[in-house]
């Protein structure tokens, strides 16, 4: 039985051309992660293996960082950024959790609070 | 001035599909995301997903995966939803509403949905 | 998900009125960067919802100063200072920090 929960940075907005950190927790679970999986829609970001350590996929290599823990930095943002990321932890015994955070990158002149709802 | 003009009620057969849509005016189509909300029986308000026009990008509420799809044209800055599968319990109004910092500010004025047979 | 409790289900109100609406939701609605996206709606007979305030406090374009919202965390309010007839409606609180976006249950504003 699966007991765990994740919980997430929660979402995000940020400015265009700042950097965010992504990060998940597995709580309420005795269970060993064995890797976390980073992914954007269908796109494999970064993996992060129990025994291996990271890899960044090659096309993000340039602007996704590893950690801090077992999150993910993204640097240098652009409004493509603007999308849902999955943490997915491979666990044992448990086996699979899925947290969800959702990153909106604004145009930095509208990043700011005053602005958001001003500019159509 | 931003509008978002929907399209007009349905009255659809259980187990069809059916697709609505919902045209945005006035502002920047792909520099906001578009939601799409569901009002059953003039009851609650649940959040069914999101696309961001820019790069098609979608989340969903899992409780309409596989019920809901959403897509936009950016050529005609139209958003759609499809219905899939369609049972009573998918009748009621639904919205599309376009968010900037998780708040939706602007609202179309609604599709009413009926499924019978 | 993240469940959204909204208090009271019916408030029944005379014009001139001063009202609270509550609205609790089941975990912290602000993210790690300190931003919280909690937002208020009304949503009148016949028509399609209409944002009041956003991110907790923050007015929308065109609304009256009589709305206020406060609140942090997990414990939210919408205040209403002098209630008009245009004010009745259906009033829901909406959290957008965590997937997926989740709505209150609604608190209908009627006349007494």
């Known amino acids: 039985m699966m007991t765990g929960t994740i919980e997430t940075t929660g979402n995000i907005s940020a400015e265009k051309g700042g950097s965010i950190i992504l990060q998940c927790h597995l709580s309420s679970t005795t269970a060993q992660v064995t890797q976390v999986n980073w992914e954007q829609q269908d796109q494999l970001l970064a993996i992060c293996n129990a025994d291996l350590g990271w890899h960044i996929s090659p096309s993000f290599k340039d602007r996704v960082a590893p950690g801090p823990g077992l999150g993910l930095t993204l640097q240098s943002l652009t409004v493509n950024d603007t999308g849902e990321y999955f943490c997915i932890y491979h666990t044992y015994p448990d086996g699979t959790y899925t947290g969800r955070i959702f990153l909106e990158v604004l145009e930095s002149s509208v990043a700011e609070h005053g602005a958001r709802f001003q500019i159509p | 001035e931003v509008q978002l003009q929907q399209s007009g009620p349905e009255l659809v057969k259980p187990g069809a599909s059916m697709k609505i849509s919902c045209k945005a005016s006035?502002?920047?189509?792909?520099?906001?995301?578009m939601n799409w909300v569901k009002q059953s029986h003039g009851k609650n308000l649940e959040w069914i997903g999101l696309?961001?026009?820019?790069?098609?990008?979608?989340s969903y509420n899992q409780r309409f995966m596989g019920k809901a799809t959403l897509t936009v044209d950016k050529s005609s800055n139209t958003a759609y939803m499809e219905l899939l599968s369609l049972t009573s319990e998918d009748s009621a109004v639904y919205y599309c509403?376009?968010?900037?910092?998780?708040?939706?500010?602007?609202w179309g004025q609604g599709t009413s949905v009926t499924v019978s047979s | 998900d993240v469940v959204v409790t909204q208090t009271p289900l019916s408030l029944p109100v005379s014009f001139g009125d001063q009202v609270s609406i509550s609205c609790r939701s089941s975990q912290s609605l602000t993210n790690s960067y300190g931003d919280t996206y909690l937002s208020w709606y009304l949503h009148k007979p016949g028509q399609s919802p209409q944002l009041l305030i956003y991110g907790i406090s923050n007015r929308f374009s065109g609304v009256p100063d009589r709305f206020s919202g406060s609140g942090s965390g997990t414990d939210f309010t919408l205040k209403i200072s002098t209630i008009k007839p245009e004010d009745l409606g259906m009033y829901y609180c909406l959290q957008g920090t965590h997937q997926p976006w989740t709505f209150g249950g609604g608190t209908k504003l009627e006349i007494k």
């Open positions: 696309i961001f026009p820019y790069n098609g990008g979608t």
């Open positions: 509403a376009r968010s900037r910092s998780f708040a939706m500010d602007y």
């Open positions: 006035g502002y920047s189509f792909t520099g906001y995301t």
